[in-house]
Amino acid sequence: YDFTNCDFEKIKAAYLSTISKDLITYMSGTKSTEFNNTVSCSNRPHCLTEIQSLTFNPTAGCASLAKEMFAMKTKAALAIWCPGYSETQINATQAMKKRRKRKVTTNKCLEQVSQLQGLWRRFNRPLLKQQ
């Protein structure tokens, strides 16, 4: 999906009002020095691409993020503020339902959510002349 035509300000508002707090809740009890952010993004569409990938694509050691509250709210924000996003996600959602497993918060998941916080920071404030 091409995130170029999303309403970035509305997504930012959704992040700051609820998603950010859910990410903090998920990370509660984790030391702030524990993880280095290794995933970066250069502009807002790129940040959303990386955010989508880390939030919804299962990775080795962390298969369950898509069922977390922050992920569901992220999905809702993208569906509302990115034209045509919902349609592109129907097949992915059906595939995910077949893979459904119980929720386990692993260290790998905590690291992944730390990366997500970093990506959202860059989405909120990209280091570009034109934001």
Partner: antibody, heavy 119, light 107 residues
Framework: EVQLVQSGAEVKKPGSSVKVSCKAS????????IEWVRQAPGQGLEWMGV????????NYNENFKGRVTITADKSTSTAYMELSSLRSEDTAVYYC????????????WGQGTTVTVSS | DIVMTQSPDSLAVSLGERATINCKAS??????VTWYQQKPGQSPKLLIY???NHYTGVPDRFSGSGSGTDFTLTISSLQAEDVAVYYC?????????FGQGTKLEIK
């Protein structure tokens, strides 16, 4: 607890350069932007520029006409701000600050470094 | 550059009374406004981010509102420790810019 500790006060001659350091502790240095802000005596706050220590990306206030250079050393968790071609109007307290967890504000500030430019 | 203009430049309010500081942007900054408090001889402290969100530990007598070009910081019941200079800041466009500051004193 995150702390930003800046280098000591400096007295400089007009035309010279100054390099102020900002050492971070208590957080992951490379994960957060470091900003530089200055405050002339009795005046308000002026944003100078920002660095992403993880990527090395920077953005500067063009009002400084290329006189500002911001760098970061990940190995020592230290950011630096160098200001060249100093003039008397550059006399100010220089602050480093770290972005907050949302990327929308500066939540931790250094104690400030006084730079005096005088002949 | 986006110019942030605060009003008034200084303000004297009685203890327990409401203090209101305004900030006007020269063009729309959406909701990308932050408020800082600076006491004499100290570094600035973050109060409110993204117009109306309290930073951790900030008393709820502080509140922020507005959008677009007009923003307000309100202290609902002034306390002695609130004497300081208050700055608004926009982070919607580079370069980031601050208001000139509003000095708040006790009447």
């Amino acid at each position: 607890e995150v702390q930003l500790v800046q280098s000591g006060a400096e007295v400089k001659k007009p035309g010279s350069s100054v390099k102020v350091s900002c050492k971070a502790s208590g957080g992951t240095f490379s994960n957060y932007l470091i900003e530089w802000v200055r405050q002339a005596p009795g005046q308000g706050l002026e944003w100078m520029g920002v660095i992403d220590p993880g990527q090395g990306d920077t953005n500067y206030n063009e009002n400084f006409k290329g006189r500002v250079t911001i760098t970061a050393d990940k190995s020592t968790s230290t950011a630096y701000m160098e200001l060249s071609s100093l003039r008397s109007e550059d006399t100010a307290v220089y602050y480093c600050a770290r972005e907050d967890n949302t990327g929308t504000a500066f939540d931790y500030w250094g104690q400030g470094t006084t730079v005096t430019v005088s002949s | 550059d986006i110019v942030m203009t605060q009003s008034p430049d200084s303000l004297a309010v009685s203890l327990g009374e409401r203090a209101t500081i305004n900030c006007k942007a020269s063009q729309s900054v959406s909701s990308d406004v932050t408020w800082y408090q600076q006491k004499p001889g100290q570094s600035p402290k973050l109060l409110i981010y993204y117009v109306s969100n309290h930073y951790t530990g900030v008393p709820d007598r502080f509140s922020g509102s507005g959008s677009g070009t007009d923003f307000t910081l309100t202290i609902s019941s002034l306390q002695a420790e609130d004497v300081a200079v208050y700055y608004c800041q926009q982070h919607h466009r580079f370069p980031l810019t601050f208001g000139q500051g509003t000095k708040l004193e006790i009447k």
